[in-house]
Interface confidence: low
């Protein structure tokens, strides 16, 4: 059968057989990912994701990784990724713990960004960055 | 590339009013953003707020917050929306282009429209 | 909500000299020194002269020269010709979460 590039009600088939995004957000393996173009800072960014029915992305498979980084252009974006300093453990907010590397670390830094490197970046929770957003696909 | 602002009017205290910035020759980048700055006559430079194309997020100065909305019409006008308008508000202003705040990309308004006058009195 | 301070606000210099403004950020602004300087002429839009401190926009000669760091920010412009008389702003930005952008409030420049 045909896939159509864009539909009427607002969503696109993307790279998958009966499986679709909303319009500008990306697919892959059976999950939908929004790579905003507006900053703000950590809360604001979980908030901005939850307003779209989505959480800041779970990236926790190299695949995954691999797959953001491609699309990412050269920016910073933040991901559902925080330093927990009582267990001195990064978490995700699904809370998964974190065994991975993040470079950068600081006492100010609790949170984390892809995007700029090829590593996941710790980064003050209250400056602005982009945002990367994730739900399942319909 | 240009940009130019239209919609500029006297109106009477408690009037609102929409300007519209409209460019020619380009049409916005997903990655800019759209943003309105005012200037009373003689006075300081004051930014309002900018639209992010892309997603269509906005961000105000404080005072602005509640009475000026900012939205994108086309992919070659956005909009001021100003209500409840005062003296205060007499100004002229400038719609400008933002190509990217984010990664190194920097900070800097690098086109501008001539301005439209806004007029507030009774 | 950031605020910039610039001084002198008017400045008198000769045709050739160097002219040094100074803008004061009230924080610290945004990673990556995200401030910038434009220059605006009666009757006329701002036009941008540098950005992210010390880089200079599209066209802008080596003559304007942007330094600083943190919360200090100074534009020099060199070997100044009669062109050169206008308003300078500098402009700091610092994210969404924190009311955006501002601008200083000028120095008007007159050359001699």
């Known amino acids: 059968p045909q896939i159509f590039n864009k539909s009427n009600d607002g969503f696109t088939t993307t790279r998958s057989y009966g499986t679709v995004c909303p319009k500008d957000w990306e697919f892959y393996q059976a999950r939908c990912f929004f790579l905003s173009t507006s900053e703000s800072s950590w809360n604001e960014s979980r908030d901005f994701c939850k307003g779209k029915g989505s959480t800041l992305a779970i990236v926790n498979t190299p695949e995954k990784l691999k797959f953001l980084q491609d699309i990412t252009d050269a920016e910073k974006y933040f991901i559902g990724l925080i330093y927990h300093r009582e267990e001195k453990r990064w978490r995700w907010i699904n809370n998964s713990v974190f065994n991975g590397n993040v470079t950068n670390q600081n006492q100010n830094f609790n949170c984390a960004t892809i995007g700029l490197t090829k590593t996941f970046d710790a980064a003050s929770c209250d400056i602005s960055y982009r945002r990367i957003c994730e739900k399942n696909a319909k | 590339q240009s940009l130019e602002e239209s919609g500029g009017d006297l109106v009477k205290p408690g009037a609102s009013l929409t300007l519209t910035c409209t460019a020619s020759?380009?049409?916005?980048?997903?990655?800019?953003?759209m943003c309105w700055v005012r200037q009373a006559p003689g006075k300081c430079l004051e930014w309002i707020g900018c639209?992010?194309?892309?997603?269509?997020?906005t961000y105000y100065a404080s005072w602005a917050k509640g009475r000026f909305t900012i939205s994108k019409t086309s992919s070659t006008s956005v909009t001021l929306q100003m209500t409840r308008l005062t003296a205060a508000d007499t100004a002229t202003y400038f719609c400008?282009?933002?190509?990217?705040?984010?990664?190194?990309?920097?900070?800097?308004?690098?086109?501008w429209g001539p301005g439209t006058l806004v007029t507030v009195s009774s | 909500a950031i605020v910039m301070t610039q001084t002198p606000s008017s400045k008198s210099v000769p045709v050739g000299d160097t002219v040094t403004i100074n803008c004061q950020a009230s924080e610290s602004v945004d990673r990556n020194n995200r401030l910038a300087w434009f220059q605006q002429k009666p009757g006329q839009p701002p036009k941008l002269l540098i950005y992210t401190t010390s880089t200079l926009a599209s066209g802008v000669p080596s003559r304007f020269k942007g330094s600083g760091s943190g919360t200090h920010f100074t534009l020099t412009i060199s070997d100044v010709v009669p062109d050169d008389a206008a308003t300078y702003y500098c402009?700091?930005?610092?994210?969404?979460?924190?009311?955006?952008?501002?601008f200083g409030c000028g120095t008007e420049v007159v050359v001699k």
């Open positions: 020759g380009f049409s916005f980048s997903r990655s800019s953003y």
């Open positions: 639209l992010s194309v892309g997603d269509g997020h």
């Open positions: 402009a700091g930005y610092r994210g969404a979460h924190t009311d955006g952008d501002a």
């Open positions: 400008a282009r933002a190509p990217s705040y984010s990664g190194d990309g920097g900070h800097g308004y690098d086109l």
